[in-house]
């Protein structure tokens, strides 16, 4: 089938005192091969500081997955979710605390 780019959505939630969890979700993409990871100051975080979900079918012939990491509150701006799919990439910052999501359909 043809390539379908993912919709990428970044959310944040309180984790523990002074920390937040940032989660990056990619959905609606085809084929299933995707790179999704967190970067700090432009550089990929090590694997052991990130948690990944499986790449799963979403019921529409496309796929979804997620990656999360825990960071210090106040450091959010240093982090971006990096997505790579079918030769294209995009970067997705963490929204500020008063706005909880960032939707971006990668073209």
């Amino acid at each position: 089938g043809s390539t379908v780019p993912p919709m990428v959505n970044v959310t944040r939630s309180e984790a523990s005192e002074g920390n937040i969890t940032v989660t990056c979700r990619a959905s609606g993409f085809y084929p299933w091969n995707i790179t999704l990871s967190w970067r700090q100051d432009g550089v990929s975080l090590s694997h052991d500081t990130q948690q990944w979900g499986d790449v799963l079918p979403d019921g529409n012939g496309t796929y979804q997955t997620w990656v999360a990491t825990r960071i210090c509150q106040g450091e959010e701006q240093r982090f971006t979710c990096y997505m790579e799919h079918s030769g294209n990439h995009s970067t997705h910052p963490v929204p500020s605390g008063n706005s909880h999501h960032h939707h971006h359909h990668h073209h």
């Epitope: 100051d41 432009g42 701006q77 030769g87 990439h89 970067t91």
Partner: antibody, heavy 117, light 107 residues
Amino acid sequence: EVQLVQSGAEVKKPGASVKVSCKASGYAFTNYLIEWVRQAPGQGLEWIGAINPGSGATNYNEKFKDRATLTADKSTNTAYLELSSLRSEDTAVYFCARFLGNYFDNWGQGTLVTVSS
Amino acid sequence: DIQMTQSPSSLSASVGDRVTITCRASGNIHSYLAWYQQKPGKAPKLLIYYAETLADGVPSRFSGSGSGTDFTLTISSLQPEDFATYYCQQFWTTPYTFGQGTKVEIK
């Protein structure tokens, strides 16, 4: 010291193509995205696109998607911008820059591309 | 695309003056805004990122503020080397867009 050194000025005819290089030093080339920006004479700045030198994955401004090609050579730590089907309005200084998370921290010196018949 | 509107487009000031440049985004860009200084024939130089963080080596007379859609660059006491053109740039979403620039000239 982080440095981005670009190739020299080019003069091209309308309809031709140009390839501008950006050689990186002083950091791990494959760890950071390289961005491309242009500036027409006396005008503002315009983002063209970005490449991940490690994987070759790209992100283009829709305006340039049909004519711009971004590549990178890991063996020489060099990123390239090729712009095809040149027209007079492509006359500009073309800059490469390093993407440090959520801003551009280091820029090349710029390459003037002149399109004239 | 997010449009960035800078004002004024140019201004005349004297050494020692306090100068304020504003940048307005057409949508919420949180704090993902950078300010650059550019002199003729040179590449832009990063001054401020994340709306208010001073880049390394930039004098403390430069400061930035704002979030959401409205941002300000302030030069508290203009120095001879500050006469240049200043640009804002948003990093919330691609295409990354710049303001049209503000030229600071000698009165």
